[in-house]
Amino acid sequence: PAQVAFTPYAPEPGSTCRLREYYDQTAQMCCSKCSPGQHAKAFCTKTSDTVCDSCEDSTYTQLWNWVPECLSCGSRCSSDQVETQACTREQNRICTCRPGWYCALSKQEGCRLCAPLRKCRPGFGVARPGTETSDVVCKPCAPGTFSNTTSSTDICRPHQICNVVAIPGNASMDAVCTSTSPTRSMAPGAVHLPQPVSTRSQHTQPTPEPSTAPSTSFLLPMGPSPPAEGSTGD
């Protein structure tokens, strides 16, 4: 039967190190990786294996690795965010946007920057609702419909149908009837769209229309990605 090699060991030509091992280019040996929540305190040599140590507070490693230092957890979630995953030795903190906000600048996991969902002003209704990663799209109310609210969820509603019209409706106001029994083509009352649903898909940010409430542009410098923790092999 084949001998089981204990780390560190010299790999055979054309072979790779085993699962949870890496090839140390200095030692020229296959050596043990450190488990999630740990990092390499000392790299292996020809005669001694990798020495692993636990990540310090506010740092983590998520994968089997041989990084000399654990990665720093992201900064605390801002007031427009909620912490959906806490920082532990094995995982980074994940911040997501609170209800009524969407992610304007995402990162590998969670959101870097949240922005408030656009509110459609009177005369405009929601054409496409906001999601976790895309803003609301507004559209002008078509003839026969109106919206008299500033809202990120209200769509254009049909005017009530009057026997006798006192004041005709327009895009931002319902018709006013003189008769006592107006009818509608839809059930009365405001129609609300559901709050943003959870989605991982990325949507193209629509260009703000002159008809919408003012929206702030957000810009942040993009820092370098954290070092890869995966091993490579033949």
Epitope: A10, Q25, Q28, D234
Partner: antibody, heavy 115, light 111 residues
């Protein structure tokens, strides 16, 4: 199979610079370091040092500190040796060799330095 | 640095006979149960071919006429029987510690 293909011969004047390439194939380039070895006419083999292909950090043997530089183009699986301010004694064949305790070698690049 | 002394510098052997090349290290090249000594063949105007790695392991595709032995400081490359195609210079190399060092080479000729 594992192959290291080096650039062609170079004829240079003293004081000039030469850059030799070594393109690797048949394995994951960033797994194994790349060493450089000098073979001067009528002389023995001298290990010049190596470059870590994962981190990009070079290590130079004592006799090759200063005018010599190792570099990488990882996306092209290629290692480079640059020699600045060439001298007559740099005339030699230079080999790249995969650093996996034993070595797989390139075919060599002859550099001739002559006025 | 580990100094490798190779002997003889040249060797003339009849076809079908045994050729033995020695390599002595100034200090042990053993670590973790391995001897980090390797043997290469260089034919005239060509590059190096790995024959034996870690003292006694035959590289894939190399004929079994080539064998290696030894540990710590004393190593031997044996070619038996020698063929005409074996005319070349043979080098030992250690990789137990940096800098890698090489023997001075042994030139094998046919008698």
């Amino acid at each position: 199979q594992i192959q290291l293909v080096q650039s062609g011969p170079e004829l240079k004047k003293p004081g000039e610079t030469v850059k030799i390439s070594c393109k690797a194939s048949g394995y994951t380039f960033t797994t194994f370091g790349m060493s450089w070895v000098k073979q001067a006419p009528g002389k023995g083999l001298k290990w010049m040092g190596w470059i870590n292909t994962y981190s990009g950090v070079p290590t130079y043997a004592d006799d090759f500190k200063g005018r010599f530089a190792f570099s990488l183009e990882t996306s092209a699986s290629t290692a480079y040796l640059q020699i600045n301010n060439l001298k007559n004694e740099d005339t030699a064949t230079y080999f790249c060799a995969r650093r996996s305790n034993f070595a797989y070698w390139g075919q060599g690049t002859l550099v001739t330095v002559s006025a | 640095d580990i100094v490798l002394t190779q002997s003889p510098a040249s060797l003339a052997v009849s076809l079908g006979q045994r050729a033995t090349i020695s390599c002595r290290a100034s200090e042990s090249v053993d670590s973790s149960g391995n001897s980090f000594m390797h043997w290469y063949q260089q034919k005239a105007g060509q590059s190096f071919k790995l024959l034996i790695y870690r003292a006694s392991n035959l590289e894939s595709g190399i004929p079994a006429r080539f064998s290696g032995s030894g540990s710590r400081t004393d190593f031997t490359l044996t070619i038996n029987p020698v063929e005409a195609d074996d005319v070349a210079t043979y080098y030992c190399q250690q990789s137990n510690e940096d800098p890698w060092t090489f023997g001075g080479g042994t030139k094998l000729e046919i008698k």
